[in-house]
Interface confidence: low
C-alpha cells in the first residue's frame, strides 16, 4: 500500500515570496507523484516546480496560486493511486492603484458646497489599513468639516469648499506591508474671489516690423486685475509704457499688441491676474523674432542613368523651423513619381539624360526665403569622335596618338603601353582631349598603346601599335678626338644603324687613301703599327640607299703615353723637418704634373710657404707637422692619357737618444734628416 | 529725489587700475539697469558699458574700447554699481558718469533720466 | 558698431532764430533716437526721446523729427539760455552710440 509519510498542509503565504508545499511517499513498488491544483494537473514552470515530492514555488503569485493543491502518488504498475489531504494558501498582498473621483460623476461637476467623495484603489489581503493626504500633510477624522474613516478607502469632503484644494494622496498597509496610490488626485475648488484664467497667452513668432498679439483672459467674482510685464518685470500699460514699448497697446479685454516688432522687443511677457482673494495667477508666454540663416552650398552632383539618387537639402537654421521643397525649372516637385521630393530629398529614380539640369532647394519661414542651387549632370557613356591608329612615328621627332570621344561629363582619357599606365612625364603629354604626344620618340617607343575613356557611366578602348621609323645616326657616335699609341696596334671604332643597315667606311679628311698598313674593317679602322704620320684628321661616312649618308670627323693624334721615371716612396719624416716626395713622368705630349695631399688637389697658386712644386714635379713641404701625415698622390696627364702613384707621409716625433745607443745608431724606420 | 553719486577718480598711472562707485537712491535701483558713460575734456559723449539686473542675471556688455580692461559689477544691498578700470591708457582720461533709465532694467532704455555729477579719472605718467 | 554723424559741429545765431541740427545714422535705426543737451560743467540732460517726442518739462520751442536714418532738432527761436553742446544719441542696437555733438553759440 501507498503510505504519505509527510503530507501538505495549509499555511500563510506572501505576495512574491518562496514557499513549500510537501509530500513524502513510501510504498513496495515504483510510484511516480504528481500535484493537482482544483483538480488539474500542475504543469512545471520556472515560478512553480516539483522538488522530489514536494511542491515548491519560488514566487508565491496571489492569482495563479489561489485555490486546492493535492499530492498524488501512483503505482503505474498495479494501478494503486493515493491522495493527501487538501492544502491551499492563505496569500497576504498589497497592490498600490489610483485616487480616483467617486463622487460626483465628473470634475466638471465639483462646485463649491457639493459633496466630493474620493476612493483610494489599494487593494490588499488581509484587508489594509488606509491613511489620507492633501499636499502631503495627513488628514484625520473630522478634521476641517471632511468625513473621513482612516479605515474606510473612501474619503469625504462635505461640503467642499476652496480650503480643500489640493493634491489627494493615500497610502495603506496591511500584514503583507505598505503602499501609496500610485496616482494623485488634484481638487481645484475655485473660490469665485480667486483669478481663473480663462484664455492663456501662447507664444508667437513674428517677423521684424509685423505685430504681435498676446491674448489673455481670467475671470473671479468681484473682476480680477490683470497687468502685463515684460522681462524686467516693468508694467506695460497704455498710460505708461517701457521706452521700447512704446508700440504696446492692451485693450479691454486683456489682450497685448504689440506692433513694428523690433528685436528688443523679443523676450518672456507675463500677464498676471489677481483676484479679491488668492495668490496671483501668472501665465508666461515669449515673443520671438523670426530668423533664417544662410543655406550650405551644394557641390555638383553626376549621376549615371538608370540609378536611383538623392539629393538632401540641409534646411537653414531658423525659427520657426523653415520649410523645405525642391524646385526644377520653376515648378515645384512632386512628393511621389520618378523624380519627387521626399521629406528634405530630392529622389530622382531610374535616372534618363532629360533629368539633368539645375534644381533648387528652397526654404522659407516667416523671417524670408533662403535657396541653393544643385547642378545635376547625367553621366553618359564616352564616344568615338577618332580613334588611335597604328602609326609609324620617326625617331627624334614628336609622335601623335589620338582618342577623340565625347559624352557627359567630359570623358578622361588614360593611356597604356605596354599594359603599363603612362603617367606624364618630361617625353609623355596627354592633352585635353585625350590625344597622346610622346617627345623626342625613341626606338623602344614603337609597341602597343591603349587609351581608355571613361566617365561614371562607363567606359570606352581602343588601341594601336607604333612602328618607329629609325633615322640614319652612329652607335654610338665616335668620339672627335682621339689617341693612338705611337708604335703600338691600334683601332678605331665606328657603327651606324639606319631603317635599312648602312655600310660604313673611313677616308681621311684631306680626301687621301689609307696607307697600306691601316685598313678599314667593317667599319673599324686598324692601324697594324701606330707611326708619327697616322695623326690627322679621319672621316667616317654611314650611308644607306632611303637615307642618304652622314658623316663623323675624327681627329687622331699619335702619342708617347705616359710612364713614370721616378716615383714618391713611403716616407717617414721627424716633425719640423722637411719632406721630399719625387715624382717625374715622361711621355709624348710631355705630361704635366700635379699633387693631390689628403684627398685634394694641391693648387700650386695656393700652397703657401712651406710648400713647393719643383719644375721636375717633386714636392717639397717645410717644417712638417702631424697634420701632413696621409697619402700623397703624384698625377701626371697629357692630352691623351693620365696615370698616378701614390705613396705615404708620416710625421714623427723626433726620440730623444737613450744612453745605450750610440751618437751614431741608426733609426728603426727609412728617415729623410735635413 | 533721485539721486546718482560717483566717486573713486582720480590720478593713476598708464597701465594702473581704479574702481569708480556710484552711489544710488530715490528709485529701484535693483531692477534697474545701469550704464556708465564717459567724456574727455572738449570731446563727445563715449557709452562705457551697462550691467543689468539680477532678473536678467546680471548681464553686462561693453565699448569695444574698454572690453576686456574695464568690468562693470553692482551690489543690490547697497544700491551701488562699480567700474572696476584695469591697465588704463592715457585715452581712457575722462569725466566718468553713471546713468540709469530709472525704472528700466532694460538694454534699449530709451534715454537716460538720471545722470551723476560725474568723477575725473586722469591717465598720466 | 552703428555710427551717429552729426552736422554742423558748431554754429552761431542770433536770439530769435531758428536753429537745425541734423543726424545720420550708418543703418536703418527706425525711431530709436534722442536729443540731449549738455551744458558746460553739468551732465546731459534728454529733450526728446524715440526722435520725436518732447520729454516732460522741455520748452516746446524745441522739436525732432525723422526715421529710419535721417533725423533733425530744431530749436524754432533760439533763446540765450539755450548755449549749449546739443548730442544725437541712438539707442537700436549695443552699444549705444552718440553723435559728435554740435556747439551752438549766440552771435
Known amino acids: 500500500a501507498i503510505v504519505f509519510i509527510k503530507q501538505p498542509s495549509s499555511q500563510d503565504a506572501l505576495q512574491g515570496r518562496r514557499a513549500l508545499l510537501r509530500c513524502e511517499v513510501e510504498a513496495p513498488g515504483l510510484v511516480h507523484v504528481y500535484w493537482l491544483l482544483d483538480g488539474a494537473p500542475v504543469q512545471d514552470t520556472e515560478r512553480r516546480f516539483t522538488q522530489g515530492s514536494s511542491l515548491s514555488f519560488a514566487a508565491v503569485d496571489r492569482l495563479q496560486d489561489s485555490g486546492t493543491f493535492q499530492c498524488v502518488a501512483r503505482d503505474d504498475v498495479t494501478g494503486e493511486e493515493a491522495r493527501s489531504a487538501n492544502a491551499s494558501f492563505n496569500i497576504k498582498w498589497i497592490e498600490a492603484g489610483p485616487v480616483v473621483l467617486k463622487h460626483p460623476a465628473s470634475e466638471a461637476e465639483i462646485q463649491p458646497q457639493t459633496q466630493v467623495t474620493l476612493r483610494c484603489h489599494i487593494d490588499g489581503h488581509p484587508r489594509p489599513t488606509y491613511q489620507w493626504f492633501r499636499d502631503g500633510t495627513p488628514l484625520s477624522d473630522g478634521q476641517s468639516n471632511n468625513t473621513v474613516s482612516s479605515k474606510e478607502r473612501n474619503l469625504t469632503l462635505r461640503p467642499a469648499g476652496p480650503e480643500h484644494s489640493g493634491l489627494y494622496s493615500c497610502c495603506a498597509h496591511n500584514a503583507f506591508g505598505q503602499a501609496c496610490s500610485s496616482q494623485n488626485f488634484t481638487l481645484s475648488i475655485a473660490d469665485e474671489s480667486f483669478a481663473r484664467v480663462v484664455l492663456a497667452p501662447q507664444d508667437v513668432i513674428v517677423a521684424r516690423n509685423e505685430e504681435a498679439m498676446f491674448h489673455c483672459q481670467f475671470s473671479a467674482q468681484p473682476p480680477p486685475n490683470l497687468q502685463w510685464l515684460f522681462e524686467d518685470e516693468t508694467p506695460i500699460t497704455n498710460r505708461s509704457r517701457p521706452p521700447h514699448l512704446r508700440r504696446a497697446t492692451v485693450f479691454a479685454n486683456g489682450s497685448l499688441l504689440l506692433t513694428q516688432v523690433r528685436p528688443r522687443n523679443a523676450g518672456v511677457y507675463r500677464c498676471i491676474g489677481q483676484g479679491q482673494r488668492g495668490p496671483p495667477v501668472i501665465l508666461e508666454a515669449t515673443l520671438h523674432l523670426a530668423e533664417i540663416e544662410d543655406m550650405p552650398l551644394f557641390e555638383p552632383r553626376v549621376f549615371t542613368a538608370g540609378s536611383e539618387e538623392r539629393v538632401t537639402c540641409l534646411p537653414p537654421k531658423g525659427l520657426p523651423e523653415p520649410s523645405v521643397w525642391w524646385e526644377h525649372a520653376g515648378v515645384r516637385l512632386p512628393t511621389h513619381g520618378r523624380v519627387y521630393q521626399k521629406g528634405h530629398e530630392l529622389v530622382l529614380a531610374s535616372i534618363a539624360e532629360s533629368d539633368a539640369g539645375v534644381y533648387t532647394c528652397h526654404a522659407a519661414n516667416l523671417a524670408g526665403q533662403r535657396r541653393q542651387d544643385v547642378n545635376i549632370t547625367v553621366a553618359t557613356v564616352p564616344t568615338w569622335l577618332k580613334k588611335p591608329q597604328d602609326s609609324q612615328l620617326e625617331e627624334g621627332k614628336p609622335g601623335y596618338l589620338h582618342c577623340l570621344t565625347q559624352a557627359t561629363p567630359k570623358p578622361t582619357v588614360v593611356w597604356y603601353r605596354n599594359q603599363m599606365l603612362i603617367s606624364e612625364d618630361s617625353r609623355f603629354e596627354v592633352f585635353k582631349n585625350g590625344t597622346l604626344r610622346i617627345n623626342n620618340v625613341e626606338v623602344y617607343d614603337g609597341t602597343w598603346y591603349r587609351c581608355v575613356s571613361s566617365t561614371p557611366a562607363g567606359s570606352i578602348e581602343a588601341q594601336a601599335r607604333v612602328q618607329v621609323l629609325e633615322k640614319l645616326k652612329f652607335t654610338p657616335p665616335p668620339q672627335p678626338q682621339q689617341c693612338m699609341e705611337f708604335d703600338k696596334e691600334a683601332t678605331v671604332p665606328c657603327s651606324a644603324t639606319g631603317r635599312e643597315k648602312p655600310t660604313i667606311k673611313w677616308e681621311r679628311a684631306d680626301g687621301s687613301s689609307l696607307p697600306e698598313w691601316v685598313t678599314d674593317n667593317a667599319g673599324t679602322l686598324h692601324f697594324a703599327r701606330v707611326t708619327r704620320d697616322d695623326a690627322g684628321n679621319y672621316t667616317c661616312i654611314a650611308s644607306n640607299g632611303p637615307q642618304g649618308q652622314i658623316r663623323a670627323h675624327v681627329q687622331l693624334t699619335v702619342a708617347v703615353f705616359i710612364t713614370f721615371k721616378v716615383e714618391p716612396e713611403r716616407t717617414t719624416v721627424y716633425q719640423g723637418h722637411t719632406a721630399l716626395l719625387q715624382c717625374e713622368a715622361q711621355g709624348d705630349p710631355k705630361p704635366l704634373i700635379q699633387w693631390k695631399g689628403k684627398d685634394r688637389i694641391l693648387d700650386p697658386t695656393k700652397l703657401g710657404p712651406r710648400m713647393h712644386i719643383f719644375q721636375n714635379g717633386s714636392l717639397v713641404i717645410h717644417d712638417v707637422a702631424p697634420e701632413d701625415s696621409g697619402r700623397y698622390t703624384c698625377i701626371a696627364g697629357n692630352s691623351c692619357n693620365i696615370k698616378h702613384t701614390e705613396a705615404p707621409l708620416y710625421v714623427v716625433d723626433k726620440p730623444v737618444p737613450e744612453e745605450s745607443e750610440g751618437p751614431g745608431s741608426p733609426p728603426p724606420y727609412k728617415m729623410i734628416q735635413t | 529725489e533721485v539721486q546718482l553719486v560717483e566717486s573713486g577718480g582720480g590720478l593713476v598711472q598708464p597701465g594702473g587700475s581704479l574702481k569708480l562707485s556710484c552711489a544710488a537712491s530715490?528709485?529701484?535701483?535693483?531692477?534697474?539697469?545701469m550704464h556708465w558713460v564717459r567724456q574727455a575734456s572738449g570731446k563727445g559723449l563715449e557709452w562705457v558699458g551697462r550691467?543689468?539686473?539680477?532678473?536678467?542675471?546680471?548681464?553686462?556688455a561693453y565699448a569695444a574700447s574698454v572690453k576686456g580692461r574695464f568690468t562693470i559689477s553692482r551690489d543690490d544691498s547697497k544700491n551701488t554699481a562699480y567700474l572696476q578700470m584695469n591697465s588704463l591708457k592715457t585715452e581712457d582720461t575722462a569725466v566718468y558718469y553713471c546713468?540709469?533709465?530709472?525704472?528700466?532694467?532694460?538694454?534699449?532704455?530709451?534715454?537716460?533720466?538720471?545722470w551723476g555729477q560725474g568723477t575725473l579719472v586722469t591717465v598720466s605718467s | 558698431d552703428i555710427q551717429m554723424t552729426q552736422s554742423p559741429s558748431s554754429l552761431s545765431a542770433s536770439v530769435g532764430d531758428r536753429v537745425t541740427i541734423t543726424c545720420q545714422a550708418s543703418?536703418?535705426?527706425?525711431?530709436?533716437l534722442n536729443w540731449y543737451q549738455q551744458k558746460p560743467g553739468k551732465a546731459p540732460k534728454v529733450l526728446i526721446y524715440?526722435?520725436?517726442n518732447l520729454e516732460t518739462g522741455v520748452p516746446s520751442r524745441f522739436s525732432g523729427s525723422g526715421s529710419g536714418t535721417d533725423f533733425t532738432f530744431t530749436i524754432s527761436s533760439l533763446q540765450p539760455e539755450d548755449i549749449a553742446t546739443y548730442y544725437c544719441q541712438q539707442y537700436d542696437n549695443l552699444p549705444l552710440t552718440f553723435g559728435g555733438g554740435t556747439k551752438v553759440e549766440i552771435k
Open positions: 543703418q536703418d535705426i527706425s525711431n530709436y
Open positions: 546713468t540709469s533709465r530709472g525704472y528700466s532694467g532694460y538694454d534699449y532704455s530709451s534715454y537716460f533720466d538720471y
Open positions: 524715440d526722435a520725436s
Open positions: 550691467i543689468r539686473s539680477k532678473a536678467n542675471s546680471y548681464a553686462t
Open positions: 530715490g528709485f529701484t535701483f535693483s531692477g534697474s539697469a
